[in-house]
């Protein structure tokens, strides 16, 4: 009687079983009642990563400059490339498929985490006594000056934007 | 050489739900995301969401309720199921390799359309 | 919600006219943006990403600009075949995955 499962690594086809390619291998022809399953290496710039009976190799993944990527990791004839973000960029998800310049916090917002390959910079209002006035991917927000500790006087208040302004103290005559 | 196709149902009654499948060759689903566009008739293409190469999925916001997006990377192929289908949803559904990312290989798309 | 503005929706021009159509993100989306051209019946082509890197076998009489929440796709003179639909697409995040209304180009 013809089988109707086969065992693991096996395949069901024309009422028999046959073996499957083994990664890094694709399958050139099936077997037969008098001869085994045969397969091929994938060429160089190919895989298969599994116990397979695909027909054709997968090509190596391709780590697109255009899309922020470089190679990471070499692909095997049984493994695909792995790629990462150029430097000063990060993926745009998990699978990190594209990579983009990591965002600046405006004026008004500083540094709160310092991006890294796979998250964006994340940026924080600057609160009351703190300032950034420039765009940047590193700067926290910096606090006030303090005018007094410089026996000075507050000539110009400071915003989220802006440092206090300081100015000598009116002397009395 | 590296193919997706979009299939399914061409007609959904109201309520229904729609599922199409999206079968891809060349590549495998471990190294590439999938996700799903749909272009209503005369109208502006729409991302509904897509499944990364690690298997997590993502939707559009306006979408999510309604979406789920899976995969069988054995069978390769990446399933689009949406739920309480209305006559608005009737559109060309395409498939696209890639999850976060830009899409350079698109399905020929499938025409579903949605009436009683 | 994320929105991606695409202007104009329509505009006509003549064959070897430059033309210009911007893309107006509602937040930063840094250089997460690409192009694409449509033709009636078929699936859109990638010409664009990363704002303004060419995809493969684009010509060169594209280009795109901008980062940030402004970009700009310009066909320095246009030809017959780019009598299209032209869309924009950010992937800053899946969050920010959307595409623009579309900018129709058609003949004068």
């Known amino acids: 009687e013809p089988p109707t499962a086969c065992r693991e690594k096996q395949y069901l086809i024309n009422s028999q079983c046959c073996s499957l390619c083994q990664p890094g291998q694709k399958l050139v022809s099936d077997c037969t009642e008098f001869t085994e399953t045969e397969c091929l290496p994938c060429s160089e710039s190919e895989f298969l990563d599994t116990w397979n009976r695909e027909t054709r190799c997968h090509q190596h993944k391709y780590c697109d400059p255009n899309l922020g990527l470089q190679v990471q990791q070499k692909g095997t004839s049984e493994t695909d490339t792995i790629c990462t973000c150029e430097e000063g960029l990060h993926c745009t998800s998990e699978s990190c498929e594209s990579c983009v310049p990591h965002r600046s916090c405006l004026p008004g917002f500083g540094v709160k985490q310092i991006a890294t390959g796979v998250s964006d910079t994340i940026c924080e209002p600057c609160p009351v006594g703190f300032f950034s006035n420039v765009s940047s991917a590193f700067e926290k927000c910096r606090p006030w000056t303090s005018c007094e500790t410089k026996d000075l006087v507050v000539q110009q208040a400071g915003t989220n934007k802006t440092d206090v302004v300081c100015g000598p103290q009116d002397r009395q005559r | 050489e590296v193919t997706v196709k979009e299939s399914g149902p061409v007609l959904v009654k109201p309520t229904e739900t729609l599922t199409l499948t999206c079968t891809v060759s060349g590549f495998s689903l471990s190294s590439y995301g999938v996700s799903w566009i749909r272009q209503p008739p005369g109208k502006a293409l729409e991302w509904l969401g897509g499944?990364?190469?690690?298997?997590?999925?993502y939707y559009a916001s306006w979408a999510k309720s309604r979406l789920t997006i899976s995969r069988d990377t054995n069978l390769k192929q990446v399933v689009l199921t949406m739920t309480n289908m209305d006559p608005v949803d009737t559109a060309t559904y395409y498939c696209?390799?890639?999850?976060?990312?830009?899409?350079?290989?698109w399905g020929q798309g499938t025409l579903v359309t949605v009436s009683s | 919600a994320f929105q991606l503005t695409q202007s104009p929706s329509s505009l006509s021009a003549s064959v070897g006219d430059r033309v210009t159509i911007t893309c107006q993100a509602s937040q930063s989306i840094s250089t997460g943006l690409a192009w694409y051209q449509q033709k009636p019946g078929k699936p859109p082509k990638l010409l664009i990403v990363g704002a303004s890197n060419l995809a493969s076998g684009v010509p060169s009489r594209f280009s795109g600009s901008g980062s940030g929440t402004d970009f700009t796709l310009t066909i320095s003179s246009l030809q017959p075949e780019d009598f299209a639909t032209y869309y924009c697409?950010?992937?800053?995040?899946?969050?920010?995955?959307?595409f623009g209304g579309g900018t129709k180009v058609e003949i004068k």
């Open positions: 696209a390799r890639g999850g976060i990312t830009v899409y350079a290989m």
């Open positions: 697409q950010s992937y800053f995040s899946s969050s920010s995955t959307v």
């Open positions: 499944i990364g190469s690690d298997g997590s999925a």
